[in-house]
């Protein structure tokens, strides 16, 4: 149940903060998709602690997830993905406190891969690619992109481009010659589904080429 | 110990609503989901709907949409279930009943109100 | 939806011998059937749930059985309280009672 105390007692365990959150990722493995939850304090002590997500499931009224470090996780086949899931943190038959949560809206994809940056020298431009394994998936397979790519030498200036293709050209006149450049990129949903940025994708690093003095232009790298 | 507390019986108008009560009182009421069942007379017993008085999260058979609305104050520790444009088919007993301890949806209940009979005339 | 049929809708039997009514879902309900008995001008009394767990302070007498679509409830020791209407309840998706079973004596 939501709520507290099975027996109506309220007990000192009651006055911490369970409070939690938690992540889907949809066909993850296969057909199978996972469940993530972590405490959002991270001095809660979970010795005793459990989750339970019930409702909104093919078959079972109730799982339990496996506990993985300061984590908690379930991989499962079971999620309807319609309706809202009652997940709940319990300490023995005990429920301390409840979330329901439709599970198409916590959704966090997996990360882009295979990020690369190609200059092409007649057209003055970098071409910058990247995979996703949603282009494959059943359910959350529309993404919104956001590569963000900065000088090495700036630490903290980002320039983000937001794109829902796995294409986007840099014009070589907008970036600094003779520069090494990090780029990145990460996706959210972006139709029906709703949720949470992946993971950044690895890094990539490119260098942009010398001014050409005579022409004005880049040298190629 | 447990009590679910029910008002005897409401006559209402044909076309009018009445909103029914359920009290609750010896346990903690937002640990236990609420169900309401329907009793026509010399019939058998029909699942209206459930709510969770923590955060009034209703499941409800569709039948009832719309004729049923489930809500709680935690501040009384009651339940209410509002039934609108009544006919005679309205005309019933209707109770309360606290559900089994458990997170599931859909899950069986252990005590009841005596119910509240709800008379449809003009 | 998933239907009850609950058998026989009503039972004549003798005090202290034993009844057993059933109850067949129109799909396999995972043991998720409970067993009401219900007096008048009560609210109905919770016997059994999970297809066979006793609740606290329900005698011995009354016990349950059953999986899958097919599950029976019976008393022992017939005794007069235990004259009543009786109901099965599936909860594994909605819930939905059966017709019940009139029980009288004999």
């Known amino acids: 149940e939501s709520g507290y105390a099975q027996n109506g007692d309220l007990e000192d365990a009651e006055l911490d903060d369970y409070s939690f959150s938690c992540y889907s990722q949809l066909e993850v493995n296969g057909s199978q998709h996972s469940l993530t939850c972590a405490f959002e304090d991270p001095d809660v002590n979970i010795t005793n602690l459990e989750f339970e997500i019930c409702g909104a499931l093919v078959e079972v009224k109730c799982l339990n997830f496996r506990k993985l470090q300061e984590i908690y996780f379930i991989e499962t086949k079971k999620f309807l993905l319609i309706g809202k899931s009652n997940i709940c943190v319990k300490v023995g038959e005990k429920s301390l406190t409840c979330k329901k949560i439709d599970l198409t809206t916590i959704v966090k994809p997996e990360a882009p891969f295979d990020l690369s940056v190609v200059y092409r020298e007649g057209a003055n431009d970098f071409v910058v690619t990247f995979n996703t394994s949603h282009l494959q998936k059943k359910y959350v397979k529309v993404l919104m992109h956001d590569v963000a790519y900065r000088q090495e030498k700036d630490e903290n200036k980002w320039t983000h481009v937001n794109l829902s293709s796995t294409k986007l050209t840099l014009l070589q006149r907008k970036l600094q010659p003779a520069a090494m450049y990090e780029i990145k990129v990460r996706s959210i949903p972006d139709h029906y589904f709703k949720g949470f940025w992946s993971e950044w994708s690895p890094s990539y690093y490119f260098r942009t080429p010398e001014i050409n003095n005579s022409s004005g232009e880049m040298d190629p790298i | 110990q447990v009590q679910l507390q029910q008002p005897g019986a409401e006559l209402v108008m044909p076309g009018a609503s009445v909103k029914l009560s359920c009290k609750a009182s010896?346990?903690?009421?937002?640990?236990?989901?609420m169900h309401w069942v329907k009793q026509r007379p010399g019939e058998g017993l029909e699942w209206i709907g459930e709510?969770?008085?923590?955060?009034?999260?209703?499941n409800d058979n569709q039948k009832f949409k719309g004729k049923a609305t489930l809500t709680v104050d935690k501040s009384s520790s009651t339940a209410y279930m509002q039934l609108s444009s009544l006919t005679s088919e309205d005309s019933a007993v209707y109770y309360c009943?606290?559900?089994?301890?458990?997170?599931?949806?859909?899950?069986?209940?252990?005590?009841w109100g005596q119910g509240t009979s709800v008379t449809v005339s003009s | 939806d998933i239907q009850m049929t609950q058998s026989p809708s009503s039972l004549s039997a003798s005090l202290g011998g034993k009844v057993t009514i059933t109850c067949k879902a129109s799909?396999?309900?995972?043991?998720?059937i409970a067993w009401y008995q219900h007096k008048p001008g009560k609210g109905p009394r919770l016997l059994i749930h999970?297809?066979?767990t006793l609740q606290p302070g329900i005698p011995s007498r009354f016990s349950g059985s059953g999986s899958g679509r097919d599950y029976s409830f019976s008393i022992s020791n017939l005794e007069p309280v235990d004259i009543a209407t009786y109901y099965c309840?599936?909860?594994?998706?909605?819930?939905?009672f059966g017709a019940g079973t009139k029980l009288e004596l004999k």
């Open positions: 709510i969770d008085p923590s955060d009034s999260y209703t």
């Open positions: 999970y297809t066979s």
């Open positions: 309840l599936q909860y594994d998706n909605l819930l939905t």
């Open positions: 010896g346990y903690t009421f937002t640990s236990y989901w």
């Open positions: 799909q396999d309900i995972k043991k998720y």
């Open positions: 009943a606290r559900r089994l301890y458990s997170n599931s949806y859909y899950y069986a209940m252990d005590y």
